[in-house]
Interface confidence: low
């Protein structure tokens, strides 16, 4: 194992780091460690503000998490030659806060991407696809992880945050080999009905820990190897009967449904015999109503119709949506 | 240097339980799946279960499923494996193996030496 | 689950043979096929991965072909140490089910 420990250069992030000169086989940027037996370099916790321009050839999973990078431009790992063994990219809680299209062109082998906890203020509609055809280059990306990726409201954009990923994730149909998106705790109050529909290759999804109140303009129709959905932690008050029915209509799904406020009242009975007759949920057991009053903390699956009933006098903004 | 340490195996009664745990070091334990690979004398090499980097999700064969409890505590770089209700068949050498970039592009790069796990009255 | 079917289940060559196993899955599985050596008593090694790249130290003479249902292991140049069980896997479904190894023997 061989690291490097001297201070980093100051010199202004090259234009094109393709032009720069290549590293030497064993080189080590500095401020990182690099093991060529392990394929890996990390450049943790380094307050990095820019990606080292020569990185080992011979990279296979890199580290670069902890740092202050602010924004990923177009080309920001390509080098010549290119980063091709490259297959796992952790970019994690580097105060990124904005991510051009073309950031991770030239990387033919990356199969994993980490962008968790990052305030991304502005994620570029061709970050993942690097074109703005319609149809891009399919990209290599198999596991793309962008939790607590919301920035502060302070820091939002005009357009909707859930819009602006959405954007990314459907660009040139590029990500149609994806097989595990992670997009938990981004307080998403929803998700743009066409995303998944490019999206067919998905196996896992994990949406847990924001803010979704419904699931009615969600088709998961054609996610037919989806085999885990993650939504505990989220706002839902009822699943009504069309996504009941796409959800036990998926060969092999698992569904995590812990800690949503679910509204017992008659726009609940369709789900609770769906929960009585189904293996798709995990834990359906836990799942307890959170309203009305009256309901509180009974557990869904000892419900009968008889429980379910609407007050008439309920204001319909209480009701389900 | 990445190494895999398991440990806890031995003799145990039918319908007995064990705890196997696999220490790892060497690499930034939290960013990897992690996974169970057992081996009957004489046998082929069978996937038991395995577990994302988060700890968040587990996988199971249908052999050891509600049986068998993967889990995985990353401020100790530990791996555990909760074998309860255990039959003669599950009597095998228990290797803890790591998967290199996540769990559906995977592959295991790394291994440990393994642990003997044996059922027998 | 996907069925993992190798062959031939043993196998015996010579020092300096070009030795070929075969993997078949139950169903496609991409390029999501990794094979493994065991020796008597030792964890499996990683050989290839990805179908067809060759992991790190690994000496040039493995390689790995094919895509879909049909893999194949080829040693180009037997050498003494290469004497031992072979197992491919697939990480395409949700269960990474294994084949039930090539042995390789000494003729």
């Known amino acids: 194992t061989s690291s490097a420990s001297s201070s980093s250069s100051s010199a202004p992030f090259l234009a094109s780091a393709a032009s720069a000169q290549p590293p030497l086989p064993d080189q080590c940027p500095a401020l990182c460690e690099c093991s060529e037996a392990a394929r890996t370099v990390k450049c943790v916790n380094r307050n990095l503000t820019e990606v080292p321009t020569d990185l080992p050839l011979y990279v296979r999973n890199l580290f670069l998490t902890g740092n202050q990078l602010a924004v990923l431009p177009a080309g920001a790992f390509a080098r010549r030659p290119p980063l091709a063994e490259l297959a796992a990219l952790n970019l994690s809680g580097s105060r990124l806060d904005e991510v051009r299209g073309g950031a991770f062109e030239h990387l033919p082998s990356l199969r994993q991407l980490d962008l968790s906890h990052n305030p991304l203020a502005y994620l570029s509609p061709f970050a993942f696809s690097g074109s703005n055809a319609s149809i891009s280059a399919p990209s290599p990306l198999v596991e793309l992880i962008l939790n607590h990726i919301v920035p502060p409201d302070d820091k939002r954009q005009n357009r909707s945050f859930e819009g602006m990923v959405a954007a990314a994730l459907v660009a040139g149909r590029a990500l149609q080999g994806l097989h595990l998106l992670e997009l938990a705790s981004n307080h998403f109050l929803y998700l743009p009905r066409d995303v998944l529909a490019q999206l067919p290759s998905l196996r896992y999804l994990d949406l847990s820990n924001n803010s979704l109140v419904s699931l009615t303009y969600v088709s998961f129709r054609n996610l037919t190897h989806l085999e885990s959905l993650h939504l505990e932690d989220n706002a839902l008050k009822v699943l009504h009967n069309g996504t009941l029915a796409e959800l036990q209509g998926l060969p092999h799904v698992r569904v995590f449904l812990d800690n949503n406020p679910w509204v017992c009242d008659c726009h609940m009975a369709d789900m609770v015999t769906w929960l009585k007759q189904t293996g798709v949920v995990q834990g359906k057991d836990r799942l307890t109503c959170a309203f009305p009053e009256k309901m509180r903390n009974r557990v869904l699956l000892e419900l009968n119709s008889a429980d379910l009933d609407c007050d008439p006098i309920l204001p319909p903004s209480l009701q389900t949506s | 240097e990445v190494q895999l340490l398991e440990s806890g195996g031995g003799l145990v009664q039918p319908g007995g339980s064990l705890r196997l745990s696999c220490a790892a070091s060497?690499?930034?334990?939290?960013?990897?799946?992690m996974s169970w690979v057992r081996q009957a004398p004489g046998k082929c090499l069978e996937w038991v279960s395995a577990?994302?980097?988060?700890?968040?999700?587990?996988y199971y064969a249908d052999s050891v499923k509600g049986r068998f409890t993967i889990s995985r505590d990353n401020s100790k770089n530990t791996l555990y494996l909760q074998m309860n209700s255990l039959r003669a068949e599950d009597t095998a050498v228990y290797y803890c193996?790591?998967?290199?970039?996540?769990?559906?592009?995977?592959?295991?790069?790394?291994w440990g030496q393994g642990t003997l796990v044996t059922v027998s009255s | 689950d996907i069925q993992m079917t190798q062959s031939p289940s043993s196998l015996s060559a010579s020092v300096g043979d070009r030795v070929t196993i075969t993997c078949r899955a139950s169903?496609?599985?991409?390029?999501?096929l990794n094979w493994y050596q065991q020796k008597p008593g030792k964890a499996p090694k990683l050989l290839i991965y990805a179908a067809s790249s060759l992991q790190s130290g690994v000496p040039s003479r493995f390689s790995g072909s094919g895509s879909g249902t049909d893999f194949t292991l080829t040693i180009s140049s037997l050498q003494p140490e290469d004497f031992a069980t072979y197992y491919c896997q697939q990480t395409y479904g949700y269960l990474h089910t294994f084949g039930c190894g090539t042995r390789l023997e000494i003729k």
């Open positions: 577990i994302s980097g988060s700890g968040g999700s587990t």
């Open positions: 169903q496609s599985i991409s390029s999501y």
């Open positions: 060497g690499f930034t334990f939290s960013s990897y799946a």
């Open positions: 193996a790591r998967y290199y970039g996540g769990y559906y592009s995977a592959w295991m790069d790394y």
